[in-house]
Interface confidence: low
């Protein structure tokens, strides 16, 4: 790379007397400080008696004994003003100024683009005392530039509370095209136009754009950064980078895949989480999504009984959370289970079928013919039924509960027997005289409690008063309320 | 049962704005979507976008885009279709129609639709 | 977008005739997204056949559809006079979903 001044690049002499305009001298600095914080004060040791500051960037001073004569103007000497070099190249550049002796504390700092420049910039400034004048150089080197390093740079001094500033010096750090905007990855609709953009800087400037899709060149010729590619549409997927053209050279983005919105795959993975008497909870891992997002599932349900119409039933639910309760099942019965899933393109093909069954259930019909009388001599209730036509899918019988409500002038007490499946007949307790005894019975399987029957009544009359606590525990001398019989 | 009963009929100018209402009853709103279906005097049916009242998701007729907007009110179970820019071409008899999923896609009730005349 | 081309445009039968109505689709549709519907004067159209065979609720058996890849067919077995309507074919396959143009059924 060429480091190379815009400006004719003579060397001026950077001050007055013995010092050579190029520095390449044998003079040895009487002080050379490296800058700690990006700028370095010239401690001036010599008698020295206040100047009168002008304002603006040249300081004029003056010398308030009768004798003495004002001295020249102080400012910055001209040093190149454009430098252009390559990127990671090395550059060193500096700003002299001759100070009269009579200041003390002079400061010299580096800005860049307005801003001061502290910390680990590599800055030195160098003394050159002479009889009258003390010549200051202040260099600034950078190892390795980037494009951050890009910008204008000037010195400041303050002498006696006045600002001298010195000529800028631009650097102007070029390379590769430097991307801003490059092509992002999409999910499309087949046969859709899309934009994709692209957008790199120098300098160099011009810089130009070529579009490649899938290894091939898309526009024979260039477009000014930036660009913007038109699709008319795909029937693939397909992989697009851009090419940024300048006078240092190529650089290419990254590739980007442009893929092809497709119907999702199917569910994976349905499995059964929980089954009851009428529902069963299943959960499925989604397939892949074809590039858009699901939308929704449908769950789809068909009786497994060889004997069935095959009506499938369909429930619909939101993508997530991957779980659904099927309902309005039938007890005791299997099914076939899928799952189907879509996006905006359309539905999955169904998931595998997988079969599932749900448990008993309680019974749907409740004892049929109860008759209740009443047995004075022993002092209890006989009570006699007909057991219920039961389904399949209801389960198996394991029972029945009883329940017998005493009424009597205001007082209610409800009390609940169960007996074993093998009887249609039980007895039990009186539990108030002169009072009215209301009997219902229910089947119970696995599944629940069935329906209870229809109320029947009995009036017990009075005939003695047995006493009872508020509890079911049978009356004094029945020790067991419920006899099979 | 099903129903879906629409906003009564319209007239406009053209360059005007028409919002059409349509009211579910009978089923989970949440669950299906609502399309829009429109049929000029004397021609076919012309179907216009859908709403999945769920989460608001709309898909349009790229036809229609930048001029319709569908919305819905979950706690009226309403969905609405508004067309802006009313062009004499505009003059159609509006349907809603539930969509059902059972593999996409087919409205297997409708609106008994609203007659927006646009004219001058 | 998939075009679909309903034949013939106009039909004039006389009851208890057999009726066929084909439809054409530009490109091949799975049988899943073929639907057909109904369109009585001054009515909604009503579904009469989704998913190309199936009858919805209430419709009567004469009615039946059938078809693959491009061509389907709705066929009206017995016409009566109760079936004068405009027919449409519906594709469910892509978005936008289209409608054929119509065929319309008059009773002699």
């Known amino acids: 790379a060429i480091t190379e001044a815009r400006e004719e690049a003579k060397p001026y002499p950077l001050f007055p007397g013995p010092f050579p305009g190029s520095l390449q001298t044998d003079h040895t600095p009487l002080l050379s400080l490296p800058h700690a914080s990006g700028y370095q004060p010239a401690l001036m040791f010599s008698p020295t008696q206040p100047g009168r500051p002008h304002t603006g960037n040249v300081a004029i001073p003056q010398v308030t004994s009768v004798e003495s004569k004002p001295l020249p103007p102080l400012a910055f000497k001209h040093t190149v003003g454009h430098i252009i070099l390559s990127e990671h190249k090395g550059v060193k550049f500096n700003c002299s100024i001759s100070v009269p002796n009579i200041y003390q504390d002079t400061t010299i700092s580096w800005w860049k683009d307005g801003k001061e420049l502290l910390g680990a910039h590599h800055a030195i400034t160098q003394f050159y005392p002479d009889d009258e004048v003390t010549a200051i150089i202040a260099s600034f080197s950078i190892t390795s530039v980037q494009r951050s390093d890009n910008g204008s740079y000037i010195c400041k001094m303050k002498i006696n509370n006045e600002e001298i500033v010195s000529d800028p010096i631009y650097i102007e750090v070029q390379g590769l095209p430097h991307f801003t905007k490059q092509p992002e990855s999409m999910n499309v609709t087949r046969n859709t136009a899309f934009n994709l953009t692209c957008q790199a800087v120098g300098p160099p400037e011009p810089v130009n754009i070529f579009w490649v899709q899938n290894s091939s060149r898309v526009n024979e010729q260039p477009e000014k950064s930036p660009s913007v590619l038109t699709v008319p549409g795909l029937t693939e997927m397909a992989v697009f980078s851009c090419e940024a053209h300048n006078d240092k050279g190529l650089t290419v983005s990254k590739g980007v895949q442009i893929n092809i919105k497709a119907i999702p795959s199917p569910p994976t993975e349905v499995s059964i989480r929980n089954s009851t008497a009428h529902s069963i909870l299943i959960s499925w891992v989604p397939g892949f999504d074809g590039y858009s997002p699901f939308r929704n599932c449908s769950i789809q349900v068909k009786e497994a009984d060889p004997l069935s119409n095959g009506s499938v039933m369909i429930f619909n639910t939101s993508a997530l959370p991957h779980l659904y309760q099927i309902k309005q099942l039938q007890a005791l019965a299997n099914y076939s289970i899928g799952v189907s899933c879509m996006n905006e393109i359309g539905w999955s093909a169904v998931s595998p079928w997988i079969l599932a069954s749900t448990t008993e259930g309680a019974p749907s019909v409740a004892p049929l013919n109860v008759t209740v009388f009443l047995n004075e001599s022993s002092d209890n209730v006989d009570i006699r039924w007909m057991k219920p036509p039961t389904k399949q899918q209801d389960g198996e019988l394991v029972g029945y509960r009883i329940s017998h409500v005493w009424q009597s002038a205001g007082i209610s007490k409800e009390l609940l027997e169960e007996v074993g499946q093998n009887g249609s007949r039980a007895r039990i307790s009186v539990q108030v005289h002169n009072a009215t005894c209301t009997v219902r019975i229910a089947a119970v399987t696995r599944g629940g409690v069935g329906p209870f029957s229809d109320p029947v009544k009995i009036f017990i009359p009075a005939h003695g008063w047995v006493d009872y606590a508020p509890s079911s525990t049978p009356a004094p001398g029945n020790a067991d309320p419920v006899l099979i019989i | 049962q099903v129903q879906l009963v629409q906003s009564g009929a319209e007239v406009k100018k053209p360059g005007a704005s028409v919002k059409v209402s349509c009211k579910a009853s009978?089923?989970?709103?949440?669950?299906?979507?609502i399309n829009w279906v429109r049929q000029a005097p004397g021609q076919g049916l012309e179907w216009m976008g859908w709403?999945?009242?769920?989460?608001?998701?709309?898909k349009y007729n790229e036809k229609f885009k930048g001029r319709v907007t569908m919305t819905t009110d979950t706690s009226t179970s309403t969905a609405y279709m508004e067309l802006r820019s009313l062009r004499s071409d505009d003059t159609a008899v509006y349907y809603c129609?539930?969509?059902?999923?059972?593999?996409?896609?087919?409205?297997?009730?409708w609106g008994q639709g609203t007659t927006v005349t646009v004219s001058s | 977008e998939i075009v679909l081309t309903q034949s013939p445009d106009f039909q004039s039968v006389t009851p208890k005739e057999k009726v066929t109505i084909t439809c054409s689709a530009s490109?091949?549709?799975?049988?899943?997204?073929f639907h057909w519907y109904q369109q009585k004067p001054d009515q909604s159209p009503k579904l009469l056949i989704y998913?190309?065979?199936n009858l919805a609720s209430g419709v009567p058996s004469r009615f039946s559809g059938s078809g693959s890849g491009t061509d389907y067919t709705l066929t009206i077995n017995s016409l009566e006079a109760e079936d004068a309507a405009t027919y449409y074919c519906?594709?469910?396959?892509?978005?936008?979903?289209?409608f054929g143009q119509g065929t319309k059924l008059e009773i002699k």
């Open positions: 519906q594709q469910g396959r892509s978005v936008p979903l289209t």
């Open positions: 009978g089923y989970t709103f949440t669950t299906y979507d």
């Open positions: 709403i999945y009242p769920r989460d608001g998701y709309t």
């Open positions: 490109s091949i549709i799975s049988s899943n997204y």
């Open positions: 129609a539930r969509g059902y999923y059972d593999n996409l896609y087919y409205f297997d009730y």
């Open positions: 998913r190309t065979s």
